[in-house]
Interface confidence: low
């Protein structure tokens, strides 16, 4: 921003203080710095006599030798004394420039804050997409490959990276499967992506009684209630954020099943034999 000229010392050069002002268009005059300044204190001593003019009709300035110009070499020996109330010390545009500059700065910082302020990344567990089942008759073991669907929404005005997805499946408070996906995708500003991930699960050992249930032909839909847990790790500007979801889902362990998204939450558990 510009400096206020009224704050400059009396011995500032005209280049520093008031560019391009000559005695010709000055309403006041070039003065000997011996004159009393406004607060009544003496200024510095100078070799030049006091001269006064009042404008275009004033007497020719003796120090300018009638030329209306300061002789070469004297630029640094003369000072201009201007009343504090002189309008030229308060150019009308300075306030405007200052306010405009402040406004632009505020606007830019506001925009920066608005666009760069971290917003939430929403993770919505949609449900089980498919469940593929196989059995080991000898070991009385069930193998279930469960594919789940997630919707991840980026509410930011910049891209975020889905760094990894960790998932686990629980049955009857026992973890029966885990999965981890790395470097999955980048989600653009204000964009949403649907991500499928598969968790291989094994129901065996102390839960081998489930083998009977899952292979029981008297039941058409062998639904078991599984707890799906998923944690999504996203990064932006080097900052990491984790979002977790938990949901109970029905999965049919008696056959390969493809679900309408969200359907596995509301399936009938037991159906009579026709």
């Amino acid at each position: 921003m510009g400096k206020s000229l009224s704050h400059l010392p009396l011995h500032s050069s005209k280049e520093d203080a008031y560019d391009g002002v000559t005695s010709e268009n000055m309403r006041n005059g070039l003065v000997n710095s011996e004159v009393h300044n406004e607060d009544g204190r003496n200024g510095d001593v100078s070799q030049f006599p006091y001269v006064e003019f009042t404008g275009r009709d004033s007497v020719t300035c003796p120090t300018c030798q009638g030329t209306g110009r300061i002789p070469r070499g004297q630029e640094n020996q003369l000072v201009a004394l201007i009343p504090y109330s002189d309008q030229r010390l308060r150019p009308r545009r300075t306030k405007l420039y200052v306010m405009a500059s402040v406004f632009v700065c505020l606007l830019l910082s506001g925009l920066a804050v608005f666009f760069l302020f971290p917003r939430s990344i929403d993770v919505k567990y949609i449900g089980v997409k498919s469940a593929y089942v196989s059995y080991d008759v000898q070991k009385r073991t069930i193998y279930l490959n469960i594919t789940n669907t997630l919707n991840i929404t980026n509410n930011n005005y910049y891209s975020v990276e889905v760094e990894n997805i960790t998932a686990q499946v629980q049955f009857s408070k026992t973890v029966i499967g885990k999965a981890r996906l790395n470097n999955i995708t980048i989600i653009g500003p204000l964009d949403m992506k649907q991500i499928d991930y598969t968790v291989p699960t094994v129901i065996a050992e102390e839960m081998s009684y489930m083998y009977d249930f899952c292979t029981l032909i008297s039941i058409k839909v062998h639904n078991i209630v599984l707890m799906m847990q998923v944690t999504v790790t996203t990064t932006y500007f080097g900052h990491s954020e984790q979002i977790s979801q938990e949901r109970y889902q029905y999965v049919d362990c008696g056959r390969n099943t493809t679900y309408q998204l969200g359907q596995s939450e509301y399936l009938n558990v037991l159906q009579p034999q026709q």
Partner: antibody, heavy 118, light 113 residues
Amino acid sequence: EVQLQQSGPVLVKPGPPVKISCKASGFTFTDYYIHWVKLSHGKSLEWIGLVYPYNGDTDYNQKFKGKATLTVDTSSSTAYMELNSLTSEDSAVYYCARTYYANSPDYWGQGTTVTVSS
Amino acid sequence: DIVMTQSPSSLSVSAGEKVTMSCKSSQSLLNSGNQRNYLAWYQQKPGQPPKLLIYGASTRESGVPDRFTGSGSGTDFTLTISNVQAEDLAVYYCQNDHSYPLTFGAGTKLELK
């Protein structure tokens, strides 16, 4: 300790319905199926149907469809069976029992005697 | 519906004897998927609810004494009680665990001579 506590004996006139209860304790109610079984005097056990407290799903023996209505109240871990259009044929001991992902009930209630008499 | 037929309808035994009772089903109770037979045996004493003894045709429920043995496959099943005790006097039911509706046999009543 696993318990299925059934409501006390009832003596009713033919016609109006009767509702008997089975309060579960000692296990997670919503993890199990609740079955209802009828034991008539001089007859064998008859399976009425089952209800799954997790979501209220039911499955009935065709013979008892329209006769019995099975419901649950998960907040109180209680299963209910309502018998309607009562006749003397409905006089029996009614049992509730639980199963966990199998069809063989392992715990049974003490039974509720329903006597239909004019 | 699967019809369960039990025989005999009653048995008179002395304490310490070995007893065998039979249960036949109108359809096979064998699950070809896992090669298990879905048949259960229950014991019911007067004034008490039924008690699960055997499931899967031959698996003893926890807490059931090993003198109770289940056997058989397909449509023919047997419950054997070796060394009968006084507390074993009850009605024994077999149950189709294979298909809905679940069905029970008429029962075999075990009595003391």
